[in-house]
Amino acid sequence: VSITKCNSDMNGYCLHGQCIYLVDMSQNYCRCEVGYTGVRCEHFYL
C-alpha cells in the first residue's frame, strides 16, 4: 500500500493523531495516539 503525508488542507483532520494519505485507497487515515480512538481520533478511552 502506497502511503504519504496528508495534504496541508487536512491539518487538524486527526484530533489526536497523525494523518496519513492511503494513496491506493484514495483516503486519509488517522493513526491515533495512545488512549484515543475513532475515525479522527476524537474519542478518549481509559
Partner: antibody, heavy 116, light 106 residues
C-alpha cells in the same frame, strides 16, 4: 451504500438568498469534510468552500467570503450551503462533495436559477 | 489562493491519437492533483488522484504524471467515448480547479 442526497431545484429572484441541503447516508459526516462546488451553465467547475462538521470549522474561497455560509447539522447528518445577495451569475448547479475518508464522492447536484 | 492554469482550453484529435493536457500550479502542490472527466448533463467523474493513481474501473489509456508545479494528463489512444471536458483539481491547499479542456473528435 454511501449517498449524498441534495435538495431540489430552486428559482430565486436577484437579491434573495438560497439554502441548499446535502443529506448523507451510509456514513457519518463528522468523519469527513464536506466541500461545495458550483458550475454555471456552459462554464467550468468552481470550488466555493468547505466545512469540517466535527469541529465546525469553515474555509471559503475569497470571492465568496461574506456571501456564502456553510453549516452542518451532525444530528441529522446534513450539510448546508447558503448563498445570499443572489445575482444572475449565480445561476448554476451546486454540488456537495465528501472528502477525507474517501476522495471526492459527489452529490447529484442542485440547480439554482436566479431570474427576475 | 493557488491558481491552476490548464491548457489547451479545447482540442480536436482523431480516434487513436495521443492527447495531452497540462496544468500548471502557481506554487508547489506536492502531487496533490486530481483529474476529472465530465460529459454534458453529468456530474464530474474522478479518473485520477494523487497525480497518477487511476481510480477503479478507469481504462489504462488514461494516465497522469508530474511534480512540483507542472502536471500532465494523457489519453494514450483517444476513443469516441472519451469526448468530454477534462478538469484538473489541486487539493493540496484548499481546492482549485483548472479551467477545463474540451476534447472533440476531428
Amino acid at each position: 451504500q454511501d449517498q449524498l442526497v441534495q435538495s431540489g431545484a430552486e428559482v430565486k429572484k436577484p437579491g434573495a438568498s438560497v439554502k441548499v441541503s446535502c443529506k448523507a447516508s451510509g456514513f457519518n459526516i463528522k468523519d469527513t469534510y464536506i466541500q461545495w462546488v458550483r458550475q454555471a451553465p456552459g462554464q467550468g467547475l468552481e470550488w466555493m468552500g468547505r466545512i469540517d462538521p466535527l469541529r465546525g470549522n469553515t474555509r471559503y474561497r475569497e470571492k465568496f467570503e461574506g456571501r456564502v455560509t456553510i453549516t452542518a447539522d451532525t444530528s441529522t447528518n446534513t450539510a448546508y450551503m447558503e448563498l445570499s445577495s443572489l445575482r444572475s451569475e449565480d445561476t448554476a448547479v451546486y454540488y456537495c462533495v465528501r472528502s477525507g475518508t474517501l476522495f471526492d464522492f459527489w452529490g447529484q447536484g442542485t440547480l439554482v436559477t436566479v431570474s427576475s | 489562493d493557488i491558481q491552476m492554469t490548464q491548457s489547451p482550453s479545447s482540442l480536436s484529435a482523431s480516434v487513436g491519437d495521443r492527447v495531452t493536457i497540462t496544468c500548471k500550479a502557481s506554487q508547489d502542490i506536492h502531487k496533490y492533483i486530481a483529474w476529472y472527466q465530465q460529459k454534458p448533463g453529468q456530474a464530474p467523474r474522478l479518473l485520477i488522484q494523487y497525480t497518477s493513481t487511476l481510480q477503479p474501473g478507469v481504462p489504462s489509456r488514461f494516465s497522469g504524471s508530474g511534480s512540483g508545479t507542472d502536471y500532465t494528463f494523457t489519453i494514450s489512444s483517444l476513443q469516441p467515448e472519451d469526448i468530454a471536458t477534462y478538469y484538473c483539481l489541486q487539493y493540496d491547499n484548499l481546492r482549485t480547479f483548472g479551467g477545463g479542456t474540451k476534447v472533440e473528435i476531428k
